[in-house]
């Protein structure tokens, strides 16, 4: 069974940095395993090699471990709209992202999906796209921002939150609406 | 016009299990990836989980994987929601959605079906 992860976090400094401790034998602190390696078996003794077995295809380590296991390889998630940036190697995980002119929202800390960036029809460019983040768009007068999108204020309907901003052509709006009712 | 429909939530005992089904109709059902999110009072909007066209490949939140199971019946324009190991913090009202194309905001979602884990 492997140890919670605090306890395997006290053992290990118990040994200098680049060591683990043998988790039979807390007397002896083996030499971990570089990245794109594995641990295959402890170390037999003091000054012994640790045995270390490269990772095979469609894994990783990315770091000095003592991972009984490679991690697998994450792919990019083609329903989300991503695209391979560098592909997986053993020391190093599949890099995702979005292609030109898109930018990555984060639905969740391991899950994003790619928009296109917002062309501010009708606005002004207040802030470029960015990797992580859409256009900022400021309209112009007789438009009013929804879903980062500058729509014609005569869309604006006493509901929405435009109505401020599209103060005198609400009024016209109402006028309709109000003169359409029996 | 779009229409999903969750059915399956109610009171369960923490460890049950429950099934949540959402009925799509108004699109084609067998294109489109399909999401299941959740919000728990007073707290925003989850993801829990969503699955391609093709079944293949679902994604779970690391809060769910190894105990929900998400699947879909294209034949019948039905996705599901298996839920087991229920914990209190599942407790929330369950949304299935179309996965979003335009930008980060749900165009269609249902109503939801609640998911109490209590004992």
């Known amino acids: 069974l492997v140890p919670p992860l605090r306890d395997r976090e006290k053992r290990d400094s118990v040994c200098p940095q680049g060591k683990y401790i043998h988790p039979q034998n807390n007397s002896v602190c083996c030499t971990k395993c570089h990245k794109g390696t594995y641990l295959y078996n402890d170390c037999p003794g003091p000054g012994q090699d640790t045995d270390c077995r490269e990772c095979e295809s469609g894994s990783f380590t990315a770091s000095e471990n003592h991972l009984r296991h490679c991690l697998s390889c994450s792919k990019c998630r083609k329903e989300m709209g991503q695209v391979e940036i560098s592909s997986c190697t053993v020391d190093r995980d599949t890099v995702c992202g979005c292609r030109k002119n898109q930018y990555r929202y984060y639905w969740s800390e391991n899950l994003f999906q790619c928009f296109n960036c917002s062309l501010c029809l009708n606005g002004t460019v207040h802030l470029s796209c960015q990797e992580k983040q859409n256009t900022v768009c400021t309209c112009h007068a007789g438009f009013f921002l929804r879903e980062n999108e500058c729509v014609s204020c005569s869309n604006c309907k006493k509901t929405l939150e435009c109505t401020k901003l599209c103060l005198p052509q609400t009024e016209n709006v109402k006028g309709t609406e109000d003169s359409g009712t029996t | 016009e779009v229409q999903l429909l969750e059915s399956g939530g109610g009171l369960v005992q923490p460890g049950g299990s429950l099934r949540l089904s959402c009925a799509a109709s108004g699109f084609t059902f067998a294109h489109e990836t399909m999401v299941w999110v959740r919000q728990a009072p007073g707290k925003g909007l989850e993801w829990v989980s969503h699955i391609p066209p093709d079944g293949q490949d679902p994604f779970y939140a690391d809060s769910v994987k190894g105990r929900f199971t998400i699947s879909r019946d294209n034949s019948k324009n039905t996705l599901y929601l298996q839920m087991n190991s229920l914990r209190a913090e599942d407790t929330a009202v369950y949304h299935c959605?179309?996965?979003?194309?335009?930008?980060?905001?749900?165009?269609?979602w249902g109503q939801g079906t609640l998911v109490t884990v209590s004992s």
């Open positions: 959605a179309l996965l979003p194309k335009r930008g980060p905001w749900f165009d269609y």
